[in-house]
């Protein structure tokens, strides 16, 4: 279904590593910072599947959710665990895996648009010849079976870094994911400030390149907290 | 250095429309699309529209769908917001950002709409 593949597709913010610098590989994608849209999905992050700390649902890939390891554990240890199947028991939304949602405490299908921040995406056929408009009939259709670029090409929907080219990452556009640049020395890159918030960036960078970080330009540390720009710096 | 420049905000009565538009200036480079965003005081900025020129798409946010639609002309830089039957709870400041290939995303100024009851 569309709302599953949408859900699949998207990336949301991530930490860096514990130990790893923000703007590493593993913090697969940046983002510019404050941009909100209404949803009650959660979302992908890096494609390995190692145990992952966390405090929230939020900074778990889109198959997992945050939760104590061990029934009645300490609340305190989180990791990021397996998103529970289809009539699996859960307590919230973020329990049950892309495509589902929480009803009643079991995952159930999502397939009828459920949430009421539902983005609707319009999939446009033509380019109108009026300003160039994306002025198409609109129909709804997954979108794997349409790739409008070569796969791994800048700008090739893609689900995952490893389905792009060399010096690409996979990053978030709108609702799907695009083949966009890795960051080079000096590009302006995102550090994620604001924790906790729910809130999925719409426009994502990737990560900065190897040997790179994503660290304040120096001559902006006077500038005030919601201001500051960073950039890939070497290490 | 690109500059997101906006016009069309105002103050109308509930039930009318207004026409925001946003045009790149100084770009050098390709954009992937561009969206519209809106901050009501005290609130959080949220998505409204979006237009992707790489997908071929729009998008729109449930509350203003049907009654807002997006486009734009990716030639001259320019995306445009048509906001027709409009609410006093479409009162808001609006902005345009744009989703850029040299991977800073831009943000213009924001302009004010305000509907009235």
């Known amino acids: 279904t569309l709302n599953s593949v949408l859900n699949s597709n998207a990336i949301k913010n991530l930490p860096p590593p514990l130990g790893g610098a923000a703007g590493h590989p593993g913090s697969a994608v940046s983002a510019a910072p404050g941009i909100l849209y209404p949803g009650g999905n959660k979302y992908q992050t890096i494609d390995n599947y190692q145990p992952y700390p966390c405090a929230e649902d939020e900074e778990c890939g889109t198959d997992e959710y945050c939760a104590s390891p061990t029934r009645g554990g300490d609340a305190g240890v989180q990791i990021c665990l397996a998103c529970r199947k289809r009539r699996k028991r859960c307590m919230r939304h973020a329990m049950c895996c892309p495509g589902n949602y929480c009803k009643n405490g079991i995952c159930v299908s999502s397939d009828q648009n459920h949430f009421r921040g539902e983005i609707e995406e319009t999939i446009t056929e033509s380019f109108g010849n009026d300003h160039s408009t994306l002025d198409g009939y609109s129909r709804r259709t997954t979108l794997s079976s349409k790739m409008y670029h070569t796969k791994g090409q800048e700008g090739s929907v893609c689900l995952r870094s490893s389905d792009c080219a060399s010096g690409l990452c996979c990053a978030r556009h709108f609702w799907s994911k695009i083949c966009k640049p890795v960051l080079k020395e000096g590009q302006v890159c995102t550090k994620h400030r604001r924790k906790g918030s729910h809130g999925l960036e719409i426009f994502q960078r990737c990560y900065c390149g190897e040997g790179l970080s994503c660290r304040i330009q120096k001559d902006h540390h006077q500038a005030s907290n919601s201001s500051r720009l960073h950039t890939c710096q070497r290490h | 250095e690109v500059q997101l420049v906006k016009s069309g905000g105002g103050l109308v009565q509930a039930g009318g429309s207004l026409r925001l538009s946003c045009a790149a200036s100084?770009?050098?480079?390709?954009?992937?699309?561009m969206g519209w965003f809106r901050q009501a005081p005290g609130k959080e900025r949220e998505f409204v529209a979006g237009?992707?020129?790489?997908?071929?798409?729009?998008y729109y946010a449930d509350s203003v769908k049907g009654r807002f639609t997006i486009s734009g002309d990716n030639a001259k830089n320019t995306v445009y917001l048509q906001m027709n039957s409009l609410k006093p709870e479409d009162t808001a400041v609006y902005y345009c950002?744009?989703?850029?290939?040299?991977?800073?995303?831009?943000w213009g100024q924001g302009t004010q709409v305000t509907v009235s009851s």
């Open positions: 950002a744009s989703d850029e290939s040299d991977a800073y995303n831009y």
């Open positions: 100084g770009r050098t480079f390709s954009s992937y699309g």
């Open positions: 237009i992707s020129w790489t997908l071929g798409r729009t």
